[in-house]
Structures are given as structure tokens and as C-alpha cells.
């Protein structure tokens, strides 16, 4: 009879590991080399087992693989030897989250790790600002995010609460809509989703600046500064310059920091290239006219962050003509 | 020490049921694959059934696929062979031996003493 | 299923003398193959597996060759508690198979 002391017993470790949807992570499990290896990957819910992964007699070994791991999972085969049985895991689902054990055998052991994989999601929310006949409204919008995330409001950088929330899709990933209504308010508003799970915070703020009077063939400038606090220096971001028009909004500019390209849509509009080295992002509107009167939206957005800054401009008619009528 | 002593044999008409049980110990048990494998009197090996280490994944021979059914009790220690449906041919010295690990690799690194049944009318 | 054929099925030799049995596959099993010791009354003990590799506890008289079809068992100097019979025992693929045995006498 052989020592029991060949076999040793190490007790299951548990590691959690975040992943994002759609996205490859690896599950980790190393072990002490040895001979014999022979690697199992399962997936455990409440009521099964599932082999997600095998690895015996020198390579790997799928006939018993569940379906839904087919040509999403390999090992490091080369790196077997070295005493690393973690699993490359290919295009993460929501259905993956879970427990997930890793059985090695060698010669001379048996260990058992244990890895508990959470995913999650959160695609780039926006804010967006809409009128509807006389009402104007807030919209912080996340089209797939998962877990629920946290949505909070401030105004004037107090808490409020009273906001509209939608939700579609009930297992995840979710879509939701916080809509607030700010019709009548000049106040700043400021809108914070939080992924708790990603660790990913997103902020979209809203200012509405004081209204600009104009008169007919002037040239109006409109001030938008990306704020620091807000930006870190080589984070890529898009400024968006449009026009509210009977709830309908209009493209007029358009700034890519990636390329720093800039698209107008609209020749009367230019911005200071000095300023824009500076990240301000003010335009100039020139020879105004009547038809120019209205609501001019800057969005600066990047992955954390909307800012949206809001000019109401009022064009009234020059002198001569109001005289010449 | 490892250890693992099977129970259950005796003597059985042909057609009837016997269940052998082997009881384990001196290792993590639910670490290790577990295999039955016979011998005839006088005659030579022959691999019965082999149970993966979490119970997931059973394989027979031939000569009783469809008659035997092996299982386990992690919580236990130990293992079973339902055999039913007995022939003569069935008659052998059962022994339970471990696989060197989860029972994917197929070969006996421990081996217990036996027990003997015997299938005659 | 896979064959297996060991030769001699009974061989005769002294003690300190190098002996050899043989196991040939019907098919290849590459190297996944074990060889066992079984003494009269006794369960079997596992002396080799993966072709070539003792087993722990195993004496280093013991050794084992092959890979393929064609395997074998030597034993370096034969001593008298080596009385017993041999069994090789492929594990490629189910069902596993054994050799019908080899029974080896001290003369």
C-alpha cells in the first residue's frame, strides 16, 4: 500500500471575475506541474453540471461538451506543463454568468479551484434634451446595461428624485429612459449612472445658458468649453453642434477628437481654431437672420461623460428694417 | 492510507439482482474516479464500469451495458454496482480501484480486496 | 474494441535473470498503456502507466517500453517475490481491455 501522502488535498478556492458582454475573458486556475494532467471546466447552476471544457491524456477532449460552449472555450495547451489550467473563454452571454469549477489531476494531487464569473454590460448612455409642444425634458438614456444600474439626478448639484424611469427587457440586459421635466427651469441639471458591477460611472450635465439677443445680420457667438474636471487629456470625446427646431433637432457641426476632423453643416457657422486648441468649442453664427431664432445645443461627449449646454438665441428685426416696414 | 472494500457479493440465481458496494477511505474521495473491474475464476481482468469523480459522466463495457449501473454518494464515500438481470458469465471476483484522477484517464492506481459473486442456478 | 495480446502466457525463469513480456495492441494507443502485478490471491498492483513510467513505490528493476502497437515489460533481475502474473491494460479509449496474462514462475 502507497503513503496517502502522495495525495494531497487542497481545498477549493473561490475568485470572482468580472466580464463584459460579448467580450473574451479568461477564467484563471493554476496548479502544481505535475504528470497525468487531466483538466475538467464545469458550469454548476442549481440543478446540473455542465462540462464546459476537458483536458486529459495529452489534449483536449470536447465529445461531452455542453453545446453552448461549442468553439467558445480552449486552454492554453502549451502552458498545460507550466501548471496553468485557466480557460480562454470566448464571447460572454449573460447566460454564462455563474460557478464555474476547475478540477485538476496530476499524479501526485487533485485540486479543485472554483470561479465565480459575473458579467456585465454598459454601452455608452447619453443625455438628451427634448421639447415637446411647450415642455422641455431631460433624457438620460442607456440603451444595454447590466446589472440595473443606479440613477441618480441633481439640480444645482442638490439630489432630486422626481423623475420617469422605463425599463424594457426583464432578465438583462436592460434598456432605460430617466426622463425629467425641466420645462420653465434655467437651473443646472446633472444625471449619474453607475454600473456597480463594472465599476463604470457615466455623467451627463445640462446648463442653459442666458439668452442672446441678436439683431437681424449680426454674428453671434455661442460658448461651449469641455471642463477638465469632467475630460482627462487623451480621452477621446465628439462635440455635436445642433439646432432645436419645433422639437426637431438639426446637425450643424461636427468635431471628432480622434481625427480631429470637423464637418459643418451649415457655412455661416465656424469656430475658433485657437480656442478649439484650447478645447473650447464656442461658435460663431454669422449674418444672422430671423429664421435663425431658437435653441442651439453643444454636446461634448465622451464614454463617462455628456455635456450639453443650451443658447437661446432671439434675432429681432435691425433698424432699417423695422422702418423700412 | 487508502482504502476501499467491497461488500455485497454472494451467491445469486441467473436473471436476478445483486448491489455491490465499495466503501472508501484515507483520500478526498469526490476527487477521484472509481472503477469496477472483474475476474473470472481463474481467468483474467475485465473492466466493468468506471464513474467520473462528481458522478457526471458513467461508462460501460459491452458485456453489461444496458444490466449494470454504477453510482455514488460523495457525502458517503461510497460506490455502487446495481447489477440486475445476472448471467452465469457474470459470475467473478468484483473489485473496486481507483483511477489516478477524476476517472478520465483509465488505468487502476489502488485496488480493494474484492468480493466474489457467483450466478448459478 | 481493442485487442490485446501478451506473449509469453507463462514463462519460466531464475532468480537475478532479466525477463520480457510482451503486449502487442490490435490498434495504436499511442503510449496509454499500464502494466499490472497480480500475485496469487492478491488484487493487482500497478507497476507502470503511460508506457514507461514507474509507479511510485514501484522497484527501479521494473521497467516498461513501447508505444504504438507494440509495448513491453522488463524486469532487470528477476527476484523471488517477482512470482506472480502480469497483465498489460490499454486505456486509449473505452472499453478499457487487458491482456489475457502473463504468469511468471521462478524455476
Known amino acids: 500500500i502507497f503513503l496517502s501522502a502522495f495525495f494531497t488535498y487542497v481545498p477549493m478556492n473561490e475568485q470572482i471575475i468580472i466580464g463584459r458582454l460579448g467580450e473574451d475573458i479568461i477564467l484563471p486556475s493554476s496548479f502544481e506541474r505535475g504528470s497525468e494532467v487531466v483538466i475538467h471546466w464545469k458550469y454548476q447552476d442549481s440543478y446540473n453540471s455542465y462540462n464546459v471544457h476537458s483536458y486529459y491524456k495529452g489534449s483536449g477532449r470536447l465529445e461531452s461538451q455542453d453545446t453552448r460552449y461549442a468553439n467558445r472555450t480552449s486552454l492554453f495547451y502549451n502552458e498545460i506543463q507550466n501548471g496553468n489550467a485557466s480557460l480562454f473563454f470566448r464571447r460572454l452571454s449573460l447566460l454564462d454568468e455563474g460557478i464555474y469549477t476547475c478540477y485538476v489531476g496530476t499524479a501526485i494531487q487533485a485540486i479543485t479551484n472554483k470561479v465565480v464569473l459575473k458579467v456585465g454590460v454598459f454601452l455608452t448612455p447619453m443625455m438628451k434634451y427634448e421639447k415637446r409642444n411647450t415642455n422641455s425634458f431631460l433624457i438620460c438614456n442607456v440603451l444595454s446595461v447590466y446589472p440595473r444600474p443606479i440613477i441618480t439626478w441633481k439640480m444645482d448639484n442638490t439630489p432630486i428624485s422626481e423623475n420617469n424611469m422605463q425599463e424594457t427587457g426583464s432578465l438583462g440586459p436592460f434598456s432605460i429612459n430617466s426622463t425629467l421635466n425641466i420645462t420653465g427651469s434655467n437651473s443646472s441639471y446633472e444625471c449619474t449612472i453607475e454600473n456597480s458591477l463594472l465599476k463604470q460611472t457615466w455623467t451627463g450635465r445640462w446648463t442653459m445658458k442666458d439668452g442672446l439677443h441678436k439683431m437681424q445680420s449680426e454674428h453671434v457667438s455661442l460658448s461651449c468649453e469641455l471642463v477638465n474636471d469632467y475630460f482627462s487629456p487623451n480621452q477621446d470625446f465628439k462635440v455635436t453642434w445642433s439646432r432645436m427646431e419645433s422639437g426637431i433637432s438639426s446637425i450643424l457641426a461636427y468635431y471628432l477628437s480622434s481625427s480631429q476632423n470637423t464637418t459643418f453643416y451649415e457655412s455661416r457657422f465656424s469656430w475658433n481654431k485657437e480656442l478649439k486648441n484650447q478645447s473650447d468649442f464656442s461658435m460663431n453664427l454669422t449674418d444672422l437672420s430671423l429664421s435663425d431664432s431658437g435653441e442651439y445645443l453643444c454636446n461634448i461627449s465622451s464614454d463617462e461623460y455628456t455635456l450639453l449646454t443650451i443658447h437661446t438665441v432671439h434675432v429681432e428685426p435691425s433698424q432699417e428694417t423695422a422702418s423700412d416696414n | 492510507q487508502v482504502q476501499l472494500v467491497e461488500s455485497g457479493g454472494g451467491v445469486v440465481q441467473p436473471g436476478r439482482s445483486l448491489r455491490l458496494s465499495c466503501a472508501a477511505s484515507g483520500f478526498t474521495f469526490s476527487d477521484y474516479g472509481i472503477h469496477w473491474v472483474r475476474q473470472a475464476p481463474g481467468k483474467g481482468l475485465e473492466w466493468v464500469a468506471v464513474i467520473w469523480y462528481d458522478g457526471s459522466d458513467k461508462y460501460y463495457a459491452d458485456s453489461v451495458r444496458g444490466r449494470f449501473t454504477i453510482s455514488r454518494d460523495n457525502s458517503k464515500n461510497t460506490l455502487s454496482l446495481q447489477m440486475n438481470s445476472l448471467r452465469v458469465e457474470d459470475t467473478a471476483v468484483y473489485y473496486c480501484?481507483?483511477?489516478?484522477?477524476?476517472?478520465?484517464?483509465?488505468?487502476?492506481?489502488?485496488w480493494g480486496q474484492g468480493t466474489l459473486v457467483t450466478v448459478s442456478s | 474494441d481493442i485487442q490485446m495480446t501478451q506473449s509469453p502466457s507463462t514463462l519460466s525463469a531464475s532468480v537475478g535473470d532479466r525477463v520480457t513480456i510482451t503486449c502487442r495492441a490490435s490498434?495504436?494507443?499511442?503510449?496509454?498503456l499500464a502494466w499490472y502485478q497480480q500475485k496469487p490471491g492478491k488484487a493487482p498492483k500497478l507497476l507502470i502507466y503511460?508506457?514507461?513510467s514507474l509507479e511510485s513505490g514501484v522497484p527501479s528493476r521494473f521497467s516498461g517500453s513501447g508505444s504504438g502497437t507494440e509495448f513491453t515489460l522488463t524486469i532487470s533481475s528477476l527476484q523471488p517475490d517477482d512470482l506472480a502474473t502480469y497483465y498489460c491494460q490499454q486505456y486509449n479509449s473505452y472499453s478499457y481491455t487487458f491482456g489475457q496474462g502473463t504468469k511468471l514462475e521462478i524455476k
Open positions: 480501484a481507483r483511477d489516478r484522477s477524476s476517472g478520465a484517464m483509465g488505468y487502476f492506481v489502488y
Open positions: 490498434q495504436s494507443i499511442s503510449s496509454w
Open positions: 503511460k508506457a514507461s
